[in-house]
């Protein structure tokens, strides 16, 4: 296993409707074919693999599970995009990169991106 | 409704390991994201992991990282719960539990979880 830096933003915060976005670049030392990518939140004492997508280069990528994560890849880069977040989802979200194919495997993590998440005040009743 | 039976647990020493198993019937089990809790006496409920509907993303608490995996066979229906390295505070009462989606970011909390297991107890001591 040989290492790889992954570049993230420190922190995003997600829009009124719980969506977040980010980049995740990783410095690939070979013309890999074959990437996996997931994301990792570390929160409430708890690490959970939030998303995971295996692609190849070129072709966009899948995530299993009822993902809540979208994701389109150019070049060294992984544009994620993450949805339905609520207030208790906020935290420390961790780019992993492993380069699968061709040998030899490349794994990168990257430092996280923070992302907040403020749940939207519900509009006041309106009399018109 | 579906029903889960875990396998039994047991007295293990510290330091030793012990692998749980617990067995679905009912609803079709791939499709939805299982989990594992344990409860100590006078203690709450605590999650301990959790695995995928396809077994792909896993949750874990700090306390179990590196100790405990958590794995599923979709063809047998069963989840299953590797616990090695115990130490004494792992003395609980474990429960598996379904969960109602195929995974969510609040697979740690028992109030996504429908149906549950009757507990297994596992105790480390010298």
């Known amino acids: 296993c040989k290492a790889m830096h992954v570049a993230q933003p420190a922190v995003v915060l997600a829009s009124s409707r719980g969506i977040a976005s980010f980049v995740c670049e990783y410095a690939s030392p070979g013309k890999a074919t074959e990437v996996r990518v997931t994301v990792l939140r570390q929160a409430d004492s708890q690490v959970t693999e939030v998303c995971a997508a295996t692609y190849m280069m070129g072709n966009e990528l899948t995530f299993l599970d009822d993902s809540i994560c979208t994701g389109t890849s150019s070049g060294n880069q992984v544009n994620l995009t993450i949805q339905g977040l609520r207030a208790m989802d906020t935290g420390l979200y961790i780019c992993k990169v492993e380069l699968m194919y061709p040998p030899p495997y490349y794994l990168g993590i990257g430092n996280g991106t923070q992302i907040y998440v403020i749940d939207p005040e519900p509009c006041p009743d309106s009399d018109f | 409704e579906v029903q889960l039976v875990e396998s039994e647990g047991g007295l293990v020493q510290p330091g030793g390991s012990l692998r749980l198993s617990c067995s679905a019937s009912?609803?079709?089990?791939?499709?939805?994201?299982m989990g594992w809790f344990r409860q100590a006496p006078g203690k709450e409920r605590e999650f301990v992991a959790s695995?995928?509907?396809?077994?792909?993303?896993?949750s874990s608490a700090d306390s179990v990282k590196g100790r405990f995996t958590i794995s599923r066979d979709n063809a047998k229906n069963t989840v299953y719960l590797q616990m090695n390295s115990l130490k004494p505070e792992d003395t609980a009462l474990y429960y598996c539990?379904?969960?109602?989606?195929?995974?969510?970011?609040?697979?740690?909390?028992?109030?996504?979880?429908?149906?549950w297991g009757q507990g297994t107890q596992v105790t480390v001591s010298s």
């Open positions: 539990a379904r969960n109602r989606r195929a995974w969510s970011l609040s697979v740690h909390t028992t109030r996504e979880y429908d149906d």
């Open positions: 009912g609803r079709t089990f791939a499709n939805n994201a």
């Open positions: 695995i995928s509907a396809s077994g792909t993303l896993t």
